[in-house]
C-alpha cells in the first residue's frame, strides 16, 4: 500500500485584512490512524494553529467534517485575518500513540495579507 502523503496544493495564498483565509490540506490515505495538526512556521518554535484532537482555536474552523472517520480533507478557515497572521502554515499528520508522533508534513502554504480595501 502506498504511503500516506499530505497535500497542500496552494504554495501561497493572499487574503485581504479582515477576510477569512482558507488553507487547503488533504491526505491520500486513512492509514496510519492519528490526528492532523496545523502549525505556523517550522522547527522547534512553530506555533500550534489547530489541533484536531483538542485545544482552544476560536478563529479556526474546519472546512469539512474532519471528525468523520473516512474524512481525508483537513482544510481550515482562519477568520478575521490581520497582518500578524502572515507566515507559512503547515498541515502535519501524526501517528496515534502515547504521545502521538509526527508522521508527515505538507510542503506548507505561505499566507500573505493585503491591506483592507478602502
Amino acid at each position: 500500500e502506498e504511503e500516506l502523503q499530505v497535500i497542500q496544493p496552494d504554495k501561497s495564498v493572499s487574503v485581504a485584512a479582515g477576510e477569512s483565509a482558507i488553507l487547503h490540506c488533504t491526505v491520500t490515505s486513512l492509514i496510519p490512524v492519528g490526528p492532523i495538526q496545523w502549525f505556523r512556521g517550522a522547527g522547534p518554535a512553530r506555533e500550534l494553529i489547530y489541533n484536531q484532537k483538542e485545544g482552544h482555536f476560536p478563529r479556526v474552523t474546519t472546512v469539512s467534517e474532519s471528525t468523520k472517520r473516512e474524512n481525508m480533507d483537513f482544510s481550515i478557515s482562519i477568520s478575521n485575518i490581520t497582518p500578524a497572521d502572515a507566515g507559512t502554515y503547515y498541515c502535519v499528520k501524526f501517528r496515534k500513540g502515547s504521545p502521538d508522533t509526527e508522521f508527515k508534513s505538507g510542503a506548507g502554504t505561505e499566507l500573505s495579507v493585503r491591506a483592507k480595501p478602502s
Partner: antibody, heavy 117, light 108 residues
Framework: DVQLVESGGGLVRPGESLRLSCAAS????????VTWVRQAPGEGLEWVSL???????YYADSVKGRFTISRDNSKSTLYLQMNGLRAEDTAVYYC???????????WGLGTLVTVSS | EIVLTQSPGTLSVSPGERATFSCRAS??????LAWYQQKPGQAPRLLIY???TRATGIPARFSGSRSGTEFTLTISSLQSEDFAVYYC??????????FGGGTKVEIK
C-alpha cells in the same frame, strides 16, 4: 496581558538539585514553545533550553544531561529540573514565550539561582 | 554554533543624539537577527526581529538594518528611557539560539 512568573530559585550547594517553575497566563500556553534563558551576575544572556508545543526538548551543551525542561499544559506551567548544579550555573533564570519566528517576545522577571559551598 | 560579536562594548551618547551599534555573525543567518533591550534589574524586551521588523509597541525611533552578516541597530534620537544594554540574538530555525555580548548605552 501576557504574564510569566518564575519561582523556585534559591541558594544550593554544588552537586545539589533545584526545580524552577514558570506560571504562564494571558495567552494560550499549549499553542507556543517556551524557553529558559539565564544571565550570570554582571554577564550577558545565555539560552538554556526550549520545549516545543509537541513536547520536543532542546538544550544548550553546557546543561545537557543535567537539566530537564518540561511543561504541564493543564497548569500552563513550564519547569526546569536542574541536577548536578555547579558554581557556573549561578544566574538569574528567565522563562520566555517563543514566537514562531524563534524570538522571545514575553519574559518573566526571573528567579535567582545561587550555587555556592 | 553561531557566534555574535557586538561592538562597541559601551557607547556614550547625549540625550537627543543618534546611537548606532552593530552585531556581526560568524556565519550567515540571513535576516534572522533580533535585538533586545535590558534595563538594570529588569527582564529583556524584544525590540526588533527579522533584522528590521519592530516588535509590537516599539517606537519608530528604533530601526534595524543588515548588510551581509553585519547588523546595525539605530536609535534616531535617544530618550532618557533608552539608556540600557542592548543584545542581539540570531533566530534561525534551530537551537542553540545565541546572543551577542551586549552593548551598554550610557549617558555622555
Amino acid at each position: 496581558d501576557v504574564q510569566l512568573v518564575e519561582s523556585g530559585g534559591g541558594l544550593v550547594r554544588p552537586g545539589e538539585s533545584l526545580r524552577l517553575s514558570c506560571a504562564a497566563s494571558g495567552f494560550t500556553f499549549t499553542n507556543y514553545a517556551v524557553t529558559w534563558v539565564r544571565q550570570a551576575p554582571g554577564e550577558g544572556l545565555e539560552w538554556v533550553s526550549l520545549i516545543s508545543v509537541t513536547g520536543t526538548t532542546y538544550y544548550a551543551d553546557s546543561v545537557k544531561g543535567r537539566f530537564t525542561i518540561s511543561r504541564d499544559n493543564s497548569k500552563s506551567t513550564l519547569y526546569l529540573q536542574m541536577n548536578g548544579l555547579r558554581a557556573e550555573d549561578t544566574a538569574v533564570y528567565y522563562c520566555a514565550k517563543v514566537t514562531w519566528k524563534n524570538v522571545f517576545d514575553y519574559w518573566g522577571l526571573g528567579t535567582l539561582v545561587t550555587v555556592s559551598s | 554554533e553561531i557566534v555574535l560579536t557586538q561592538s562597541p562594548g559601551t557607547l556614550s551618547v547625549s540625550p537627543g543624539e543618534r546611537a548606532t551599534f552593530s552585531c556581526r555573525a560568524s556565519q550567515t543567518v540571513g535576516s534572522k537577527l533580533a535585538w533586545y533591550q535590558q534595563k538594570p534589574g529588569q527582564a529583556p524586551r524584544l525590540l526588533i526581529y527579522d533584522a528590521n521588523t519592530r516588535a509590537t509597541g516599539i517606537p519608530a525611533r528604533f530601526s534595524g538594518s543588515r548588510s551581509g552578516t553585519e547588523f546595525t541597530l539605530t536609535i534616531s534620537s535617544l530618550q532618557s528611557e533608552d539608556f540600557a544594554v542592548y543584545y542581539c540574538q540570531q533566530h534561525t530555525d534551530w537551537p542553540p539560539y545565541t546572543f551577542g555580548g551586549g552593548t551598554k548605552v550610557e549617558i555622555k
